[in-house]
Amino acid sequence: AVNGTSQFTCFYNSRANISCVWSQDGALQDTSCQVHAWPDRRRWNQTCELLPVSQASWACNLILGAPDSQKLTTVDIVTLRVLCREGVRWRVMAIQDFKPFENLRLMAPISLQVVHVETHRCNISWEISQASHYFERHLEFEARTLSPGHTWEEAPLLTLKQKQEWICLETLTPDTQYEFQVRVKPLQGEFTTWSPWSQPLAFRTKPAALGKDT
């Protein structure tokens, strides 16, 4: 939802969290603002305090319940408002009717680990976190490997078009330090976006055996 120079963007993690970012040009830095969530079908509502993340943007997380509880469904619509204090009153700065399963961003994958490493290849696995059982296999992943002397932005993206929580990296250089990241996205939702990248997993390929042609 956009009001003039105001932008209000929220995503549902598919379980019990709605994360929101509100940006407003010329907004007062010392104003107290919050996001208020009012579902159309539920008897709970939730508020979080917007905290500055840059000169003109604020963010907060609406914690709807226990991390793995399924607090919203595809039928729910949540009215989300940005409220800022003006004296003794609260002023509505932005508002949107939020459809959770059209605006998904899952948590970053966790528990990355090296399953097996060789001189030229490495098998890595991970787990998804706080993802609705609704998705079943309807997820896709992107992965990237950081090679020495390169940046993450330069790393080619590897796409896994199915729910596959492992990857075998090939054509690696022996005895070399690498880092690996993965992210996940449900196939559902018009405004759904990729999760944040996972924490990088550092690993080192095995050295080539002496006297062997590599």
């Epitope: 159309d40 079908r41 539920r42 008897r43 509880s69 399924q70 607090k71 469904t73 595809t74 039928v75 609705s132 059982h133 609704y134 998705f135 079943e136 309807h138």
Partner: antibody, heavy 120, light 106 residues
């Protein structure tokens, strides 16, 4: 104790109209979504439609929305179903049901039902 | 609309038997709910959110499943369990019910 009591059923000719009522007690009616559900003789359950607490949102089964209208009066703790252009296939027991939500959405209380017979 | 297919449509079983009723959805659903209905009576909420027993429902009942396949299980059938059981989804509008499974005495 939560109670839902339907009334207004009866025998009506094809093409006729009928208005069903559901009287609610034992809970704060004005806070709950409500639905109508019907069951034809010997058949399964069919959702008719729902209404939110302040009547600002009313949804219907696509096949019924042109002939059926749901309304409510929170001051009277009452839910209504106006049925027009009735057909023989509308013969059924009509239930009102209260919605509840834990994580999913379901019906936690049902009325005893009122029978509508459409026949000439 | 999401179509719900219950199987079997009816079954005959003896007291003490283990009974399993299956509900298949034509598309993925987040939760399945189950209702018990006895002749001439209104349905009663029986199992909600796939596996949670409604108040007063005996622990011999259980629910499970995800995606498109869900089950209601009675571990040891008792005389008061003879009834018709309906599954219901509300993961997308409109909510839909299965055709019902009638549990009869053998």
């Amino acid at each position: 104790e939560v109670q839902l009591v339907e009334s207004g059923g009866g025998l009506v000719q094809p093409g006729g109209s009928l208005r069903l009522s559901c009287a609610a007690s034992g809970f704060d009616f004005s806070r709950y979504w409500m639905s109508w559900v019907r069951q034809a003789p010997g058949k399964g359950l069919e959702w008719i439609g729902e209404i939110n607490p302040d009547s600002s949102t009313i949804n219907y089964a696509p096949s019924l929305k042109d002939r059926f209208t749901i309304s409510r009066d929170n001051a009277k703790n009452s839910l209504y179903l106006q049925m027009n252009s009735l057909r023989a296939e509308d013969t059924a027991v009509y239930y009102c049901a209260r919605h509840d939500y834990d994580e999913g959405i379901y019906f936690d209380y049902w009325g005893q039902g009122t029978t509508v017979t459409v026949s000439s | 609309d999401i179509q719900m297919t219950q199987s079997p449509s009816s079954l005959s079983a003896s007291v003490g038997d283990r009974v399993t009723i299956t509900c298949s959805a034509s598309s993925r659903v987040i939760y399945m709910h189950w209702y018990q209905q006895k002749p001439g009576k209104a349905p009663k909420r029986w199992i909600y959110d796939t596996s949670k027993l409604a108040s007063g429902v005996p622990s011999r009942f259980s629910g499970s499943g995800s995606g498109t396949e869900f089950t209601l299980t009675i571990s040891s059938l008792q005389p008061e369990d003879f009834a018709t059981y309906y599954c219901q989804q509300w993961s997308s509008n409109p909510p839909t019910f299965g055709g019902g499974t009638k549990v009869e005495i053998k």
